[in-house]
Interface confidence: low
């Protein structure tokens, strides 16, 4: 786990703001360890908050949190609640795996103990948002905040070098000849042969190709490619992913509350790279073919890592 | 689900207070966010204000700030809406409602029946 | 909080698609929802998060929210759609509602 800078002040003052602030107790002090006779932010209101701003989407797999003294009082954070934003402006409440009600973090229970709590599934996001819900005398609160890079994990999952085996690549159907057969195993990114990439038997939007990583894994991309057969040029131009953690229930991939068509290739033999922001995290992966040229025909890398790293 | 049961109707005097209840059940009302959204006759939706009971303090519309009380009771499972210095323009129907975010960004999910307020001389 | 602007009314042939706008500036910076409430009855939540369906409500009702203007989209309009329609955003912790549209179907 990183610290990802609280503490070490990467975190620059600028970016740590509040809905208010107790006499010199500001925003810019709740930096975990932080010393001196003021050293953290507080504040009497009830409705408040302290933002984080990392000028960048990260993930963020969890927080430390610590209270403060002042002469013979603690100060702490008993009980708070998480949201965050991706553009500052729409905010989200983090609600763990649960899809109901949101999650209320239990905190410190003295001024000087630091409590970890971890984000599970972790939090991608740009802005981070923590409101006490319950404290001792005055919300007071240092803290460091724990995640990574998002692009930090761009590695390739293994479909060009069988990583993933064949028996993890599957499709809604795939096309079969005499000649050949164009099953979803041979949908790896730069595979030669006679038949070198997957195609559906029917070319339609409701088809599908399918990938399990078998654990859940980060995605944050996937690179494209179309083929060459008998000189004709197949390919891809538009597709739409959705995801899964048990093989049944399925997301469509979501941007900005819409889902995201993505634009594929434009020739046969390009790799096109589309980034996934934010990444998915999931065990299966379906890629969903909208538009083509000629046929629909399928090469393709899964870009991302184990989701074990991010912990 | 979360479902939410209002008192009844009330018919007030200009200048007297109100004071309407909102009792939840079937979920977790301490995390719950429950606001009071009123109608007037013929007119659209105002939000008055709103409390989530974990944080115990209530958030108003900058219009009723000085009027509107809100509270909750989190072991009845009850939010109150008080509204002082009745006028007759605060006739109107006064619905609870809630969201299953504390802010109800998800939108306000869960609508009580309403409590129709009348202030009449 | 300024609040939102809805037309007052919007007209519609069964099957039809209707459109219902829901303007503010920058309103595409917020997250919309969308209520429809039926005469004596209390609203009820259509789309939330711009573009999202509860479970229970019909897939010809769709959102969308960019720049200055939410859209509520109803498609293959049926006589028992016909309601008023209320949009819904946030401005910081204040909630704001449009004045409302009322659909008529034809």
């Known amino acids: 786990q990183t610290p990802l800078g609280m503490a070490s002040g990467h975190i620059r003052d600028f970016q740590i703001t509040a809905s208010g602030q107790y006499g010199q107790w500001a925003p810019k002090l709740a930096r975990l360890h932080y010393s001196g006779s003021i050293n953290a932010w507080s504040t009497k209101e009830p409705f408040s908050w302290i933002k984080v701003d990392l000028l960048a989407p990260m993930i963020i797999h969890g927080i430390k949190t610590q209270g403060a003294r002042q002469k013979f009082s603690s100060l702490y954070i008993s009980q708070f609640i998480i949201m965050y934003s991706l553009d500052g402006k729409k905010w989200q409440t983090y609600r763990g795996n649960s899809t109901g009600t949101l999650m209320v973090f239990f905190g410190n229970v003295d001024s000087s103990g630091i409590k970890h709590n971890i984000f599970n599934p972790p939090i991608i996001a740009r802005y981070i948002r923590l409101h006490p819900t319950h404290y001792s005398i005055r919300s007071t609160l240092r803290m460091e905040l724990m995640g990574c890079d998002l692009n930090s994990c761009s590695m390739p999952l293994g479909m060009e070098s069988k990583a993933i085996s064949d028996a993890q690549i599957t499709a809604s159907s795939y096309f079969t000849n005499m000649f050949a057969t164009w099953s979803p195993s041979k949908a790896r990114l730069h595979l030669q042969g006679r038949s070198n990439a997957w195609r559906p038997q029917v070319n339609n939007p409701k088809e599908w190709l399918q990938v399990d990583f078998q654990k859940t894994m980060k995605v944050t991309g996937v690179t494209t490619q179309g083929v060459k057969s008998l000189l004709t040029s197949m390919y891809v131009k538009e597709f739409l992913i959705s995801s899964s953690q048990d093989g049944h229930q399925w997301t469509l991939f979501f941007q900005n509350g819409k889902v995201k068509v993505f634009q594929g290739n434009q020739d046969s033999f390009t790799p096109v790279v589309n980034s996934l922001d934010p990444p998915l995290l999931t065990r299966y992966l379906r890629i969903h073919p909208q538009s083509w040229v000629h046929q629909i025909a399928l090469r393709m890398e899964v870009l991302g890592c184990e989701a074990q790293d991010l912990y | 689900q979360v479902q939410l049961v209002q008192s009844g109707a009330e018919v007030k005097k200009p200048g007297s207070s109100v004071m309407v209840s909102c009792k939840a059940s079937?979920?977790?009302?301490?995390?719950?966010?429950i606001s009071w959204v009123r109608q007037a006759p013929g007119q659209g939706l105002e939000w008055v204000g709103g409390i989530i009971p974990i944080f115990g303090t209530a958030n108003t519309a900058r219009n009723f700030q000085n009027r509107v009380t809100i509270t909750a009771d989190e072991f009845t499972s009850t939010a109150y809406i008080r509204l002082r210095s009745l006028r007759s323009e605060d006739t109107a129907v006064y619905y609870c409602v809630g969201g299953r975010d504390a802010y109800s960004f998800d939108g306000f999910d869960v609508w009580g029946q309403g409590t129709m307020v009348t202030v009449s001389s | 909080s300024s609040g939102l602007t809805q037309p007052h009314s919007v007209s519609v042939s069964p099957g039809q698609t209707a459109n219902i706008t829901c303007s503010r500036d920058?309103?595409?910076?917020?997250?919309a929802s969308w209520y429809q409430q039926k005469p004596g009855q209390s609203p009820a939540l259509l789309i939330y998060?711009?573009?999202k369906r509860p479970s229970g409500i019909p897939e010809r009702f769709s959102g969308s929210n960019s720049g200055n203007t939410a859209t509520l989209t109803i498609s293959g309009t049926q006589a028992m759609d016909e309601a008023d329609y209320y949009c819904q955003a946030w401005d910081n912790t204040t909630a704001v509602f449009g004045g409302g549209t009322k659909l008529t179907v034809l």
């Open positions: 920058k309103l595409g910076h917020k997250f």
């Open positions: 079937g979920g977790t009302f301490s995390s719950f966010g």
């Open positions: 998060q711009d573009s």
